[in-house]
């Protein structure tokens, strides 16, 4: 067990151009407060996923009124630390979200109005018991400077707060197999306290409060011998005595979720779905009131003035869940055009565009005909993110710059010879054939299958195809 502590040093405009407007004004004075959300591990988690390590809300800062014409200074901050207690081991790697909120104190109907000014997030490695770590994060034009640390609550010590220390029973040395507790040399490392009732013969623990079974034993307290008659549901290691697989403890065996939480297995561990009023990795943190800030994403907490009464979160538009921790799926509306892929990042929607398209909603066709010229009298045709030229007779290629060989397709029938001409092609027909492509036979009596040839053009003369 221990406490994560966060100290906010400053919140104000970041360096560079485009200083933000002050969030408060003479007409609308306001004050700031902060919320921190902690999650175990370094996984890329959505902003709305539960704060499994815990969350905390700061006190309200001093009331601030902007001085007309003055740039936004560093804004006055709340006093004190934000403290997030954790009951289990400190994970060593964690993700954080720090939100800066503005409480407007004007003549609001129905109380003060809250709005999110900035949200920063990060993933860090941190050993418990170490010094304060300093950090600077930027959100848009705002900059947040802060420090943080994790410290163990006695009797826990160590980088994960899993070792327990007790005062020495003898002044000179610790008991068998137990080391002195650095840096508290006058105390001794205590044996781990397993889950109450965990079998001392068949169970063991690597963290306080757990009960892991030796091979051949099962149950929440490792008191139930595994049946070797059927060898069903193989999960654990092979038993040396029976030669078959015995079910080892699954992550949800014995339901590690407290306070009526329901357990579901995940690929690497388990996940507890907690009833309202409880949170934490195992639903072990209880007595949540509105003062603890259980409503995320700007949700308004109602009721829950004391730990015995339930609170209700009234979620702002776009959020849902008992703690407003889930975001409505806005991508269902398919706002991205031209086959773009929609991504809901929480603070904004983003579109990942297909090749040939750009813009916030993939609305711009990069390869359209704007500014594109087709040479030699060709015309541009748009479509499907690409442009093509419909070329005039005698030209080809992407931009109609290449001279087409009209004879390439062997257009002259019945052995006629093809000649390229500036306006197209000319077929010189073999004896007995006529027509633009030599497609018509000449009848033996001299008449053709077509109306008579134009005056001055004898059958067998080259026919020009225009």
């Amino acid at each position: 067990a221990g406490v994560f502590e966060l100290q906010i040093h400053s919140f104000g405009p970041g360096p560079g151009p485009g200083a933000p407007r002050s969030p408060c004004s003479a007409r609308l004075p306001c004050r700031l407060f902060f919320r921190v959300c902690l999650k175990p591990g370094l996984s890329e988690e959505a902003a709305e996923s539960p704060c499994a390590l815990g969350a905390a809300l700061s006190a309200r800062g001093p009331v601030y009124t902007e001085q007309p014409g003055a740039p936004a200074p560093d804004l006055p901050l709340p006093d004190g630390l934000l403290q997030v207690p954790f009951r289990d081991a400190w994970p060593g790697t964690f993700s954080f979200i720090i939100e800066t909120w503005r409480e407007e104190l004007g003549d609001q109907i129905g109380g003060p109005a809250w709005s999110l000014l900035a949200r920063v997030a990060g993933r860090r490695r941190l050993a418990a018991g170490g010094p304060w770590a300093r950090d600077i994060q930027r959100a848009g034009a705002w900059e947040l400077r802060f420090s943080y640390r994790a410290r163990c609550e006695p009797p826990a010590v160590g980088t994960a707060c899993t070792r327990l220390c007790r005062p020495r029973s003898a002044p000179s040395r610790c008991g068998p197999g137990l080391r002195p507790c650095a840096p508290l040399e006058d105390e001794c490392e205590a044996p781990l306290v397993c889950r109450a009732g965990c079998s001392p013969e068949h169970g063991f623990c690597e963290q306080p409060g757990e009960c892991r079974c030796l091979e051949g034993w099962t149950g929440p307290l490792c008191t139930v011998p595994v049946s070797t008659s059927s060898c069903l549901s193989p999960r654990g290691p092979s038993s040396a005595t029976t030669g078959c697989l015995v079910p080892g403890p699954g992550p949800c065996d014995g339901n590690p979720c407290a306070n009526g939480g329901s357990c579901s297995e995940t690929p690497r561990s388990f996940e507890c779905t907690c009833p309202r009023g409880f949170y934490g990795l195992r639903c072990e943190v209880s007595g949540v009131t509105c003062a603890d800030g259980p409503c995320f994403n700007g949700g308004l907490c109602v009721g829950g003035a004391d730990p015995d009464s339930a609170y209700i979160c009234h979620c702002p538009p776009g959020f849902q869940g008992s703690n407003c921790e889930k975001r409505v799926d806005r991508c269902s509306l398919q706002p991205c055009r031209n086959g773009g892929l929609c991504l809901d990042l929480g603070h904004a929607l983003r579109c990942r565009c297909r090749a040939g398209f750009a813009g916030p909603r993939c609305e711009h066709d990069l390869d359209d005909c704007a500014g594109r010229a087709c040479a030699n009298g060709g015309t541009c045709v748009e479509g499907g993110g690409a442009h093509r030229c419909s070329c005039a007779l005698g030209f080809g290629g992407r931009d109609c710059r290449e001279r087409a060989d009209p004879c390439a397709a062997r257009p002259c029938a019945h052995g006629g010879r093809c000649y390229a001409h500036f306006s197209g092609l000319v077929c010189a027909c073999a004896p007995g054939y006529m027509g633009a492509r030599c497609e018509f036979p000449v009848h033996p009596d001299g008449a053709s299958a077509l109306p008579a040839a134009p005056p001055g053009l004898r059958p067998g003369d080259p026919q020009r195809y225009l």
Epitope: P335, C336, P360, R361
Partner: nanobody, 119 residues
Amino acid sequence: EVQLVESGGGEVQPGGSLRLSCAASGSDFSINAIGWYRQAPGKQRDWVAGFTGDGVTTYAESVKGRFTISRDNAKNTVYLQMSSLRAEDTAVYYCAADVKIGGDYEWFWGQGTLVTVKP
């Protein structure tokens, strides 16, 4: 700032019909995508139907063949014609829109209108 105002909700018997309207108002905006979501008591807010960014009408499986979405661009209004209503259609229906204001896109929600289907 764009306002979305829903209307047309009410109580109806199973098998009955209702027509919801969503009027968008504001200055200097254009609608990219617009549609309807619904939230039944104690449930998640789910998408129902909409006009995509490409202007295509799309529907959730649960309402296909029963609900029809339409729009009047001149009035910046979208409609949801609901027929063959069932008890499970009882929910607060919200209008949602992805709107272009200047060069940026913003998402807006309406306040919702309640539809109750009961015998």
